[in-house]
Amino acid sequence: EVEKTACPSGKKAREIDESLIFYKKWELEACVDAALLATQMDRVNAIPFTYEQLDVLKHKLDELYPQGYPESVIQHLGYLFLKMSPEDIRKWNVTSLETLKALLEVNKGHEMSPQAPRRPLPQVATLIDRFVKGRGQLDKDTLDTLTAFYPGYLCSLSPEELSSVPPSSIWAVRPQDLDTCDPRQLDVLYPKARLAFQNMNGSEYFVKIQSFLGGAPTEDLKALSQQNVSMDLATFMKLRTDAVLPLTVAEVQKLLGPHVEGLKAEERHRPVRDWILRQRQDDLDTLGLGLQGGIPNGYLVLDLSMQEALS
């Protein structure tokens, strides 16, 4: 905390302008009125205050607004946002998408890097959480904004949080937004995507649904196999193992189309490895890929899980 000292003669700030960057921290404390700062917050970001000077400005705003800043101040915080803690942000009520965008822009890293941060920093995560809770759901505009700044944002949410995403918002999701999602998250997102894209024709539907297929059940994969979709191996490898196991060799062949040759390279990895173990070797041989490990001819396959369900 900066100690209270009298403002030197002639240094009292009448407006927030460039001359203030030459003020020492104690001069800013003594010579800048908190109310003036609050009313001229839009100017702060146009002045290259140093990180240490921002400490003083934050201290002034904290004294003026102990219960939390009003949105009129928040939307103009600019680089001062970098000084905010999650505790500060929990006091805020942010309702405007423009305010959210402005703060995310400030936080973008300030590095000339094409790689957007995968996960938000703690204060950004808190800001997003406050904003989304205030809105009640992750609407399309919000999701659009968040995934533009953080491609991995969706995958940082719990399955419970994802359940508040309306199907209409799924249109805003790009394939790269799902790169780090685990199967539990895709289980929640897939039915929403299926609903969102249900009126599209076959090939267009597949393009849109492809990145969500890690949450697809067996019956949907069987249906896709009838549509000549030519799923690539990367997508196939992300499918749920339990959804792939019941597929027949013929169904997998139809599902992958010309990409079926890629199974050989993946035969030691899940779900391909587990799927091979469930197929008759005779059927695997029809692919002509040299896949080994299937059930030898003449063996009877008992589905014990089905047996347990019946008993």
Epitope: E18, F22, A46, P48, T50, Y51, E52, Q53
Partner: antibody, heavy 120, light 107 residues
Framework: QVQLQQSGAELVKPGASLKLSCKAS????????MHWVRQAPGQGLEWIGA????????IYYQKFKSRFTITVDKSTSTAYMQLSSLTSEDTAVYYC?????????????WGQGTTVTVSS | DIVMTQSPDSLAVSLGERATITCKSS??????LAWYQQKPGQPPKLLIY???TRESGVPDRFSGSGSGTDFTLTISSLQAEDVAVYYC?????????FGQGTKLEIK
């Protein structure tokens, strides 16, 4: 990649004026403060001032404020520094440099420098 | 203005040996300090900021430490390509100021 291309060496007489240029490429010119720093022969580095190309806001080290003027031309992504009433003390290499995060004013990218010699 | 003073003015170290340069500021600058390397005919190159954070691409033989008024740049094992002049810079407040430089040579 970020590049700051500065104008060529200059030899001028005392009392003369001079305009140095710094053409930026590889980034959004209007997004970052452009600073100027000079280095006299065998001496250290001295910060002169800066401009924000989007707002035309300028800041100057007090000792240079009366004689040096920083401007930009957004259409060509070029920053300029006008030097006036030059003396032999102004003989130096003048660098333009950008700072990515204004709250952390470290010099992230530099131009190659322009050598200015003031001599009669 | 904050005055930055480096020592020594010049330093000769054997290849593979440790080189240490210090920088003192006239006021407390926290950790708002950067180090630069300048080779003849070239602009300075940022090495370290926040007193100890290495800029990406800078070899890990370069390290920085310190806070307040006393700072150190250390090159753990001197290489031939490290011959240069090294500058510290404070960015706690404007005007931004640099040390006078330390010339590092091979013994």
């Amino acid at each position: 990649q970020v590049q700051l291309q500065q104008s060529g060496a200059e030899l001028v007489k005392p009392g003369a004026s001079l305009k140095l240029s710094c053409k930026a490429s590889g980034y959004t010119f209007t997004s970052y403060w452009m600073h100027w720093v000079r280095q006299a022969p065998g001496q250290g580095l001295e910060w002169i001032g800066a401009i924000h190309p989007n707002s035309d806001n300028t800041i100057y080290y007090q000792k240079f404020k009366s004689r040096f003027t920083i401007t930009v031309d957004k259409s060509t992504s070029t920053a300029y520094m006008q030097l006036s009433s030059l003396t032999s003390e102004d003989t130096a290499v003048y660098y333009c440099a950008i700072i990515i995060t204004p709250v952390v004013p470290k010099f992230d990218y530099w131009g190659q420098g322009t050598t200015v010699t003031v001599s009669s | 203005d904050i005055v930055m003073t480096q020592s020594p003015d010049s330093l000769a170290v054997s290849l593979g040996e440790r080189a240490t340069i210090t920088c003192k500021s006239s006021h407390d600058v926290g950790t708002s300090l950067a180090w630069y390397q300048q080779k003849p005919g070239q602009p300075p190159k940022l090495l370290i900021y926040w007193a100890s954070t290495r800029e990406s691409g800078v070899p890990d033989r370069f390290s920085g430490s310190g806070s307040g008024t006393d700072f150190t740049l250390t090159i753990s094992s001197l290489q031939a390509e490290d011959v240069a002049v090294y500058y510290c810079q404070q960015y706690s407040s404007y005007p931004l100021t640099f040390g006078q430089g330390t010339k590092l040579e091979i013994k």
